[in-house]
Interface confidence: low
């Protein structure tokens, strides 16, 4: 007997072809014998079947010999074997009908699991493998789970049920909820004004919820809340702001923070954290912020970075258009009687300059 | 260390059943995934399906389909292979094999047992 | 489903040989293939998974390569405890396939 799969919500046509090519009596029935639809003349009649208002023909196909039976918005129930009865012979179809649902939303937080449940008639022994967009293959029967879901994971996901050598896919849109980037390092000299920016690597139409930016400066011996927000329809609203330092915050979307000025105490790193409404467990971003000061205190010139720098970062102090004097991988060099002229202290990462602080040196009569 | 002891080589007639075990140590049954695997006299290997722990379901290869179940005994750490209405094609060594407790590594058939020969013979 | 083409199936090698074994699947599998050892009357032993990554506990002698249909298991310097019946695994999609397996001699 023929297999023929489909898919909860769709539709399907079953086909039956008589050998003349002309209009002739048919029926469809189920395996209980139950009349579906048939045919008097070049009318379509319905029998008593729970299918009734979702069973049809195409009438422009009877005169060729063609007696298709479509059902539409498929249940997995519809899954059945279903005869046509056309010059005394009988065509069978098996019809299996499948459903493959996300659980409970298609919209995730990074971190969480995703599990795809597949509905299927009793019976059936279905496998089921589903490509991620990133192009994992996952395998399974009835429920597929990942866990550990990356922002990779956002978009469509295939999935491809396999029974009887036959094949349905499905394609079920994912979308991971996480910042852009999950860590972002800004680097700047004292008394500039430091930019912190967290895009989201989703848009959905209406967007609410509550953030907080926690700060741990290097030179603190604790965390401290610097600033909690709510969303409301991507409408953001400061709740409380520390007195020093003073944040500022965009009220539109993608959450901007400003702090007016980098200064060595407030060096160190921020987590910024956005619970969203309606969904348990919260978004991360880690923000970093590198501080550069160039000081001359008598005969001495000091360079010195704060922050959460790497070992491998290089702090050098060099004369305008010279060699560097001093090179060193640590957060703190210096020069004892320097040269006059404009002196340049860089923080760079394998010949990469991250961060430059100029100074200049006068000379001493 | 997971290690899986199966049953006895066994000699059984057209048409009857035989069930093989394998018993698992080093690790609870519950989290790992068994799969069960034949090799028939001169041929390769044959995967013949899966008890997947997650899911709590058994999957079986088209070709076994109606004809072989796979069945876990949790208070003995203990799995099960029977196959029902033998024929002589199915003379082979018979091979349990435990995959990893992760999402991705149910199917690495980790750990091996040494086999069970089963023999169909009238 | 994906049919797994593992030449030679026999090959004999002296001591301290390369020997490479060459295992080509009927469809792209991406990574999802591992290679297994096995001597008579012995469980098989799990060398390489996900294509190239050495199992734990295996001599670096062993090695692997390839993505998509075409992939290799290495051997240098080969010694005598080597010889067994290797095979490969794909575990991209059901049913998981092997191949037919390579019976290596040491001379």
């Known amino acids: 007997k023929k297999v023929v799969l489909g898919k909860k919500g769709d539709t399907v046509e079953l086909t039956c072809t008589a050998s003349q090519k002309k209009s002739i009596q048919f029926h469809w029935k189920n395996s209980n014998q139950i009349k579906i639809l048939g045919n008097q003349g070049s009318f379509l009649t319905k029998g008593p079947s729970k299918l009734n208002d979702r069973a049809d023909s195409r009438r422009s196909l009877w005169d060729q010999g063609n007696f298709p039976l479509i059902i539409k918005n498929l249940k997995i129930e519809d899954s059945d074997t279903y005869i046509c009865e056309v010059e005394d012979q009988k065509e069978e179809v098996q019809l299996l009908v499948f459903g493959l649902t996300a659980n409970s939303d298609t919209h995730l937080l990074q971190g969480q699991s995703l599990t795809l449940t597949l509905e299927s008639p009793p019976g059936s022994s279905p496998s089921v493998q589903c490509r991620s967009p990133r192009g994992k293959n996952i395998q399974g029967g009835k429920t597929l789970s990942v866990s550990q879901l990356e922002l990779q994971d956002s978009g469509t996901w295939t999935c491809t049920v396999l029974q009887n050598q036959k094949k349905v896919e499905f394609k079920i849109d994912i979308v991971v909820l996480a910042f852009q980037k999950a860590s972002s390092i800004v680097y700047k000299k004292e008394g500039e004004q430091v930019e912190f920016s967290f895009p989201l690597a989703f848009t959905v139409e209406k967007l609410t919820g509550s953030g907080e930016l926690w700060w741990q400066a290097e030179r603190a011996s604790s965390s401290k809340s610097w600033i909690t927000f709510d969303l409301k329809n991507k409408e953001v609203s400061v709740k409380r702001v520390t007195q020093d330092p003073k944040l500022q915050m965009g009220k539109k979307l993608p959450l901007h923070l400003t702090l007016p000025q980098a200064l060595p105490q407030y060096a160190g790193s921020g987590n910024l954290t956005l619970a969203l409404e309606a969904k348990t467990g919260k978004l991360h971003q880690e923000v970093n912020l590198v501080v550069m000061r160039a000081t001359q205190l008598q005969k001495n010139l000091t360079c010195e970075v704060w922050g959460p720098t790497s070992p491998k970062l290089m702090l050098s102090l060099k004369l305008e258009n010279k060699e560097a004097k001093v090179s060193k991988r640590e957060k703190a060099v210096w020069v004892l009687n320097p040269e006059a002229g404009m002196w340049q202290c860089l923080l760079s990462d394998s010949g990469q300059v991250l961060l430059e602080s100029n100074i200049k040196v006068l000379p001493t009569w | 260390q997971v290690q899986l002891v199966q049953s006895g080589a066994e000699v059984k007639k057209p048409g009857a059943s035989v069930k093989v075990s394998c018993k698992v140590s080093?690790?609870?049954?519950?989290?790992?995934?068994m799969h069960w695997v034949r090799q028939a006299p001169g041929t390769g290997l044959e995967w013949m399906g899966y008890?997947?722990?997650?899911?709590?379901?058994?999957i079986y290869t088209q070709k076994f389909q109606g004809r072989v179940t796979m069945t876990e005994d949790t208070s003995t750490d203990t799995a099960y292979m029977e196959l029902r209405s033998l024929r002589s094609e199915d003379t082979a060594v018979y091979y349990c094999?435990?995959?990893?407790?992760?999402?991705?590594?149910?199917?690495?058939?980790?750990?091996w047992g040494k086999g069970t020969t089963v023999t169909v013979s009238s | 489903e994906t049919t797994l083409t593992q030449s030679p199936a026999f090959m004999s090698a002296t001591p301290g040989d390369k020997v490479t074994i060459s295992c080509k699947a009927s469809q792209d599998i991406d990574d999802d293939m591992n290679w297994y050892q096995q001597k008579p009357g012995e469980a098989a032993i799990f060398i390489i998974q996900?294509?190239?990554t050495l199992v734990p506990g295996i001599p670096p002698r062993f090695s692997g390569s390839g993505y998509g249909t075409d992939f290799t298991l290495t051997i240098n310097n080969i010694e005598s405890e080597d010889a067994a019946y290797y095979f490969c695994?794909?575990?991209?999609?059901?049913?998981?396939?092997f191949g037919q397996g390579t019976k290596v001699e040491i001379k």
């Open positions: 080093g690790h609870t049954l519950t989290e790992l995934s």
């Open positions: 094999a435990t995959g990893g407790n992760k999402d991705y590594y149910f199917y690495y058939m980790d750990v």
């Open positions: 008890f997947n722990p997650r899911d709590d379901e058994t």
């Open positions: 996900e294509a190239t």
């Open positions: 695994l794909q575990h991209d999609n059901f049913p998981l396939t």
